[in-house]
């Protein structure tokens, strides 16, 4: 039963994680205008992977998509790629894991097949989570670099007289959503891999048969042949307590930016 609980929980955690990765990828607040130590403007800039937005104090918000592909920085393209790969792998992993769930019966699917599928989905979730964490971290690193560069530019102007205010950008809500979601997907994947160990069919030791050869009292016992699945044994059918997975993944998104062109 513990195996089913672990598998179920892994599935739910991964599902939440992948939903978070999708949400983060679609969010506009990857970078937000840094308000600290800045002249207070009546305009608030923020940017996502796909478009940049401006919110005026009057409440009017205008978003513009990045309609160029070649004009965008390689790093941004890399982040997009990592997030999309993460989503695709996660989605495939979810699909595979649905069929692998012990509580779902599909025809006469053997436990060894379910164990294989559980491990496959687990690995996919781990890679998916790593892709999301990597993507978010690359973007965060890009922000930090640009932040300090623009900070340096703020205080070095023509003869010390700075006319144009440099807009600095800091971490947006999407980064935190991405990190948390990537982490959850990773944890869910690990749980699926752990569950897979328990799903592998138990080693089948055939009963010893005594062959009585004439004139001899020798008992021949065939060795215990393992049903080879590659996942080890220990699959006693235990009763499991199916505890509900509870997650608190409430992330507030705030209204800021990073020039890509």
């Amino acid at each position: 039963m513990a195996v089913t609980a672990c598998q179920g929980l892994g599935f739910v955690v991964s599902l939440i994680g992948i939903a978070g990765i999708i949400a983060a990828t679609c969010m506009d607040q990857w970078s937000t205008q840094d308000l600290y130590n800045n002249p207070v403007t009546a305009v608030f800039n923020y940017q996502g992977l796909w478009r940049s937005c401006v919110r005026e104090s009057s409440g009017f918000t205008e978003c513009r998509g990045y309609f160029t592909l070649l004009g965008l920085p390689a790093m941004l393209q890399a982040v997009r790629a990592l997030m999309i790969v993460g989503i695709v792998l996660g989605a495939i992993g979810l699909l595979v894991s649905i069929f692998a769930l012990k509580c779902i019966r599909i025809g006469s699917m053997e436990d060894s097949a379910k164990a294989n599928m559980t491990l496959t989905s687990g690995i996919m979730f781990i890679v998916s989570g790593l892709c999301a964490i990597a993507g978010v971290s690359v973007f965060a690193n890009m922000l930090v670099t640009n932040f300090w560069m623009s900070t340096a530019n703020m205080y070095t102007g023509m003869g010390g007289m700075v006319q144009t205010v440099q807009t600095r950008y800091t971490f947006g809500a999407a980064l935190f959503v991405g990190w948390v979601a990537g982490g959850l997907t990773l944890i869910g994947g690990v749980m699926m891999c752990i569950a897979c160990r328990g799903l592998a069919p138990e080693e089948t030791n055939y009963k010893a048969v005594s062959y009585h050869a004439s004139g001899h009292s020798v008992a021949y016992k065939p060795g215990g042949f393992k049903a080879s699945t590659g996942f080890g044994s220990n699959t006693k059918n235990k009763k499991i307590y199916d505890g509900g997975a509870r997650t608190e993944d409430e992330v507030q998104s705030y209204p800021s930016k990073h020039d890509y062109v």
Epitope: P39, V40, T41, A42, V43, N45, E56, S58, G59
Partner: antibody, heavy 117, light 113 residues
Framework: VQLQESGAELVRPGTSVKVSCKAS????????IEWVKQRPGQGLEWIGM????????NYNEKFKGKATLTADKSSSTAYMQLSSLTSDDSAVYFC???????????WGQGTLVTVSA | DIMMTQSPLSLTVTAGEKVTMSCKSS????????????LTWYQQKPGQPPKLLTY???TRDSGVPARFTGSGSGTDFTLTISSVQAEDLAVYYC?????????FGGGTKLEIK
């Protein structure tokens, strides 16, 4: 869209006055209400703004402590209270509705406040 | 606070003439996020409240005649009236809508001969 301001006020120095601005013809809580001061024959000065939906305010540092902005959603009316009045506060006070580009798209007719002993 | 400097202080023209007035800000009003300049022009006729002419430096408000044109970027802005009419007698103000506190220029008084 209409912004109807209260009538002219003649007040004593040291007292306070409350100017009202009744909005009609649009969703009151969806737009900011801005307040502007114009002394006779002078230019325009921004006092501050209020978000009628949330009650959030933003003041010009110069008018902090002098002006208090409030809004009543039920009557779609914005208010500006001016305290500790002096002759420097004698002016026409306008309310205006925020628009695109943070502009002041619609204006009230103005309220003349005269501070005199 | 951002200083808004308007010039000339006043100008007198004949009807049908082209008029240009200037507004300079002490800091750039260009927002890099949408590449828009947060400068607004108002017209105030005697005894009336100001009326919005243009926002985002060059976008005419609805109902504003096409003879009014706003232009400029960064710190230098211009309001042009292509063919002045008698009803254009007013004071014209520019306003910084980018930095708090919002600040207005001293105004340019337009008089008709």
């Amino acid at each position: 869209v209409q912004l109807q301001e209260s009538g002219a006020e003649l007040v004593r120095p040291g007292t306070s006055v409350k100017v009202s601005c009744k909005a009609s013809g649009y969703a009151f809580t969806n737009y900011l209400i801005e307040w502007v001061k114009q002394r006779p024959g002078q230019g325009l000065e921004w006092i501050g703004m209020i978000n009628p939906g949330s009650g959030g305010t933003n003041y010009n540092e110069k008018f902090k402590g002098k002006a208090t902005l409030t809004a009543d959603k039920s009557s779609s009316t914005a208010y500006m209270q001016l305290s500790s009045l002096t002759s420097d506060d004698s002016a026409v006070y306008f309310c205006a509705r925020g628009g695109f580009g943070n502009s002041f798209a619609y204006w009230g007719q103005g309220t003349l406040v005269t501070v005199s002993a | 606070d951002i200083m808004m400097t308007q010039s000339p202080l006043s100008l007198t023209v004949t009807a049908g003439e082209k008029v240009t007035m200037s507004c300079k800000s002490s800091q750039s009003l260009l927002n890099s996020g949408n590449l828009k300049n947060y400068l607004t022009w108002y017209q105030q006729k005697p005894g009336q409240p100001p009326k919005l002419l243009t926002y985002w430096a060059s976008t005419r408000d609805s109902g504003v005649p096409a003879r009014f044109t706003g232009s400029g970027s960064g710190t230098d802005f211009t309001l042009t009236i292509s063919s002045v009419q008698a009803e254009d007698l007013a004071v014209y103000y520019c306003q910084n809508d980018y930095f708090y506190p919002y600040t207005f220029g001293g105004g340019t008084k337009l008089e008709i001969k």
